[in-house]
Every structure is written in structure tokens, then in C-alpha cells.
């Protein structure tokens, strides 16, 4: 008898045994996940004010309102400095107001003075129709004022604060544009 | 290593249409812009149209009107439907891809002919 209740007490004893490795189990994987989470939080954290305190525009890019133009340091032909803004995720700048040209034509001057950079305008060569590089039509006052003479394909660009017209294959510096990315904050 | 599949050339017919698909696979983390080149014989290489990676288009004076250029930014792959094709389109298109680590990769291209 006293045997008997001997190994029962031992089994117990065991039992208590595993259900107290089964708590610490549950402790340490509670713990652990508590610090994941903890960690989880953090992280977003970062990535919500890296989010909020990146820039609408790329380092040395100016903003605009929805737009960030970048001034290229180098001259290129039109159809090189085409390809120059599509490696930066971007297109030729394509001038949409008045307001918007007055913007660009101020910064210009502030940046470099008066030279010439290419934009995103070009002449068909059958029809003779500007048209900006997405296949739209320029608004009446931002066609370019002078009429290029040359019998090469005909390139738009801006210079101090008119757009005029050139061969394309002259060298400029240029102007690219893309959207400011906007804040999810 | 950096795959681009073309696919979708052909033989058609002037006034027909082709769609053109361009799928970039392998180890390519970020993509600024993807483009349609192409090349008839004797020519240089030239731009026909490109996306960037915000949907930003760029198109050549010649196709304005009749090519358009799409993107599907989930799968890596960009589209070109070509409609009222004419002769002077023919030629061998290639995809290229501009990556923002700074590199360019071409596809092998796919030939376009437009004849009656």
C-alpha cells in the first residue's frame, strides 16, 4: 500500500515537474514574443518618421507643388538628355501653366543664369505640331516663339524666361521632372 | 543576373495591330523605367517609348498617337499596343530596362514586320 502511494506521489511529482518546464516553456516564449512585438512596434515606428521626415524630392532636386525638377549640370542632345531622365525615373520637364514656366524660369535664374536646357517638347516633322514628349498638346501661351530654320528634327527649350526652338541635335543642359512623393503620414 | 523576355512581334499587315510584352525577372530590387527601343536595318537604335516607375510617358514624334506604352509594376513588365502600324515600323524592338542602381540591361528583341 504504502508502495503504491510512494509511486503515485513520484508520478505526481513528475507531472508538477513537466507542467512547471511547461510554464517556464510558456513564460520565455511570452517573453519572446512581447520583445518581438516590442521590436515589431519600433520598427514601424522608424519606418513611419523615416517615412514622414523623407523628402518629397531626391537630394538636389527642386520641389514644386506635385513635381520635383532636376537641373542637369552637363549638356547633352534632346534625345540623351531624354534618356539621361529616364535613368533618374523620370521625363523631360513638361511645362503644364504659366505658373509653372514662371517657376522654372525663377529657379534658372537663381541657379545658373541664362542658358539653355532642353525640355520634354518636340515638332512633329510631317504635320509641323509641338507636342509635349507624352503626346499632348502644349497650351496656347507655351509654344516655343521662334520657328528653328533648320531642317533637322526641331527640340524645344527654355532660356531665361521663353521657350524657343532648336535642332535637337545641338548640345543643352536639360531639365527632368517627376512627382513629389507624397507624405502617407 | 537580369532576364527581359520579349514577346508578342510578328508579321502584320499596314493599319493592323500588335501588342508587345516585355517581363524583367531576376535580381533586380528597384526599376526607374523601362523602354521600347527598336532598330530597322542600317539604322541606329532609337527610342519608341518608355514608363518610368510613377507611369511618367515619354513616346517618339513618329508613333504619337498610335503606340501606347503601359506597365504592369507587380510583375516587372511593361507593355507597347501598336496600332495603324505602317511600313516604316518595322523593325527588331528591344526592351531595356533602367535600373536604380544605376544599370541598363537589353532584351534579345523581337521582330516586327509590317507588309502587305
Known amino acids: 500500500k504504502l508502495l503504491q502511494v510512494s509511486t503515485i506521489a513520484m508520478q505526481q511529482q513528475e507531472k508538477l515537474i513537466q507542467q512547471e518546464r511547461a510554464l517556464l516553456n510558456f513564460t520565455e516564449w511570452k517573453r519572446s514574443c512581447a520583445l518581438q512585438m516590442k521590436y515589431c512596434q519600433a520598427f514601424m515606428q522608424n519606418s513611419l518618421s523615416s517615412a514622414h521626415n523623407s523628402s518629397p524630392c531626391p537630394n538636389n532636386w527642386i520641389q514644386n507643388r506635385e513635381s520635383c525638377y532636376y537641373v542637369s549640370e552637363i549638356w547633352s542632345i534632346w534625345h540623351t538628355s531624354q534618356e539621361n531622365c529616364l535613368k533618374e525615373g523620370s521625363t523631360l520637364l513638361q511645362i503644364e501653366s504659366k505658373e509653372e514656366m514662371d517657376f522654372i524660369t525663377g529657379s534658372l535664374r537663381k541657379i545658373k543664369g541664362s542658358y539653355d536646357y532642353w525640355v520634354g517638347l518636340s515638332q512633329d516633322g510631317h504635320s509641323g505640331r509641338w507636342l509635349w514628349q507624352d503626346g499632348s498638346s502644349p497650351s496656347p501661351g507655351l509654344l516655343p516663339a521662334e520657328r528653328s530654320q533648320s531642317a533637322n528634327q526641331v527640340c524645344g527649350y527654355v532660356k531665361s524666361n521663353s521657350l524657343l526652338s532648336s535642332n535637337c541635335s545641338t548640345w543643352k543642359y536639360f531639365i527632368c521632372e517627376k512627382y513629389a512623393l507624397r507624405s502617407s503620414v | 543576373q537580369v532576364q527581359l523576355q520579349e514577346s508578342g512581334g510578328g508579321l502584320v499587315q499596314p493599319g493592323g495591330s500588335l501588342r508587345l510584352s516585355c517581363a524583367a525577372s531576376g535580381s533586380i530590387s528597384s526599376i526607374n523605367a523601362m523602354g521600347w527601343y527598336r532598330q530597322a536595318p542600317g539604322n541606329q537604335r532609337e527610342l519608341v517609348a518608355a514608363i518610368t516607375n510613377q507611369g511618367r510617358v515619354t513616346y517618339a514624334d513618329s508613333v504619337k498617337g498610335r503606340f501606347t506604352i503601359s506597365r504592369d509594376g507587380a510583375k516587372n513588365t511593361v507593355y507597347l499596343q501598336m496600332n495603324s502600324l505602317k511600313p516604316e515600323d518595322t523593325a527588331v524592338y528591344y526592351c531595356?530596362?533602367?535600373?536604380?542602381?544605376?544599370?541598363?540591361?537589353w532584351g534579345k528583341g523581337t521582330q516586327v514586320t509590317v507588309s502587305s
Open positions: 531595356k530596362v533602367f535600373a536604380a542602381s544605376g544599370m541598363e540591361y
